[in-house]
């Protein structure tokens, strides 16, 4: 990880843009910790493995989280 320091948040910018759940490879929700005082959401896209930081406060991102958790609950027995 570049620019590594003991206390550092990963997200430099956060995106409000809607993300198509089908284009997602992985969605990481990193809780607040001693390293970063806020929740961070990092989406890994299928296209070229691009990683994008998402705004947890954005309506579009909240909808994405709902859609992903709904999809997960469908899959789990």
């Amino acid at each position: 990880v570049p620019l590594s320091r003991t206390v550092r948040c990963t997200c430099i910018s956060i995106s409000n843009q809607p993300v198509n759940p089908r284009s997602l490879e992985k969605l990481e929700i990193i809780p607040a910790s001693q390293f970063c005082p806020r929740v961070e959401i990092i989406a890994t896209m299928k296209k070229k493995g691009e990683k994008r930081c998402l705004n947890p406060e954005s309506k579009a991102i909240k909808n994405l989280l709902k859609a992903v958790s709904k999809e997960r609950s469908k899959r789990s027995p």
């Epitope: 948040c9 990963t10 997200c11 430099i12 995106s15 970063c36 005082p37 990683k51 930081c53």
Partner: antibody, heavy 124, light 107 residues
């Protein structure tokens, strides 16, 4: 439209201070990391400093560390560069630039919007 | 710090020709951390490529980026008159640094 406008440049004596400002419009300033980049006359680009979208972290080029401070006021859509103990080699055009949407320490989207620059001349 | 060396320093070509610009890093960097910019005299730089190979919004498809590790390339497939400018590579694998630039001039 999306725009960055720098101000505050001028002629200053060695050892003195100067504060640059960069005013953003046309986008949600509070969700983007921001940079300062400079270009000495007839030379290439030199990265100066970065600040995270919420001001939680900063980083500096070795050449300015301890002398320059980057800060932001998200309520005013404004980025700042406080420059102390100025030297002749700090003479340059200073640009503010926006970090790409969703950039992180794991993936970099480049500096996608730039201001027109403000000129700083350090001379006695 | 990661040092980026661009070559050649100057490239003299005619409109319609192919331009190949090189950027070499002093240590290996992830392709996700490399960008290319174009700068014309008296203007601010413009982002062309991020993530070593992804075109920025509004950039024509004659511009393409490739490479990994320590060697990266910007290719302009057919030079248009407006493409004559200085090109910089930039990395963010550690504190950001720019290469020294390649000037593409009209032959």
């Amino acid at each position: 439209q999306v725009q960055l406008v720098e101000s505050g440049g001028g002629v200053v004596q060695p050892g003195r201070s100067l504060r640059l400002s960069c005013t953003a419009s046309g986008f949600t300033f509070s969700t983007y990391g921001m940079h300062w980049v400079r270009q000495a006359p007839g030379k290439g680009l030199e990265w100066v400093a970065i600040i995270w979208f919420d001001g939680s972290n900063e980083d500096y080029a070795a050449s300015v560390k301890g002398r320059f401070t980057i800060s932001r006021d998200n309520s005013k859509n404004t980025l700042y560069l406080q420059m102390n103990s100025l030297r002749a080699e700090d003479t340059a055009v200073y640009y503010c630039a926006r970090e790409g949407d969703g950039s992180s320490l794991y993936y970099y989207y480049g500096m996608d919007v730039w201001g027109q620059g403000t000129t700083v001349t350090v001379s006695s | 710090e990661v040092v980026l060396t661009q070559s050649p320093g100057t490239l003299s070509l005619s409109p319609g020709e192919r331009a190949t610009l090189s950027c070499r890093a002093s240590q290996s960097i992830s392709s996700g951390y490399l960008a290319w910019y174009q700068q014309k005299p008296g203007q601010a730089p413009r982002l062309l490529i991020y993530g070593a190979s992804s075109r920025a919004t509004g950039i024509p498809d004659r511009f393409s980026g490739s490479g990994s590790g320590t060697d990266f390339t910007l290719t302009i497939s057919r030079l248009e008159p407006e493409d004559f400018a200085v090109y910089y590579c930039q990395q963010y694998g550690s504190s950001p640094t720019f290469g020294g630039g390649t000037k593409v001039e009209i032959k």
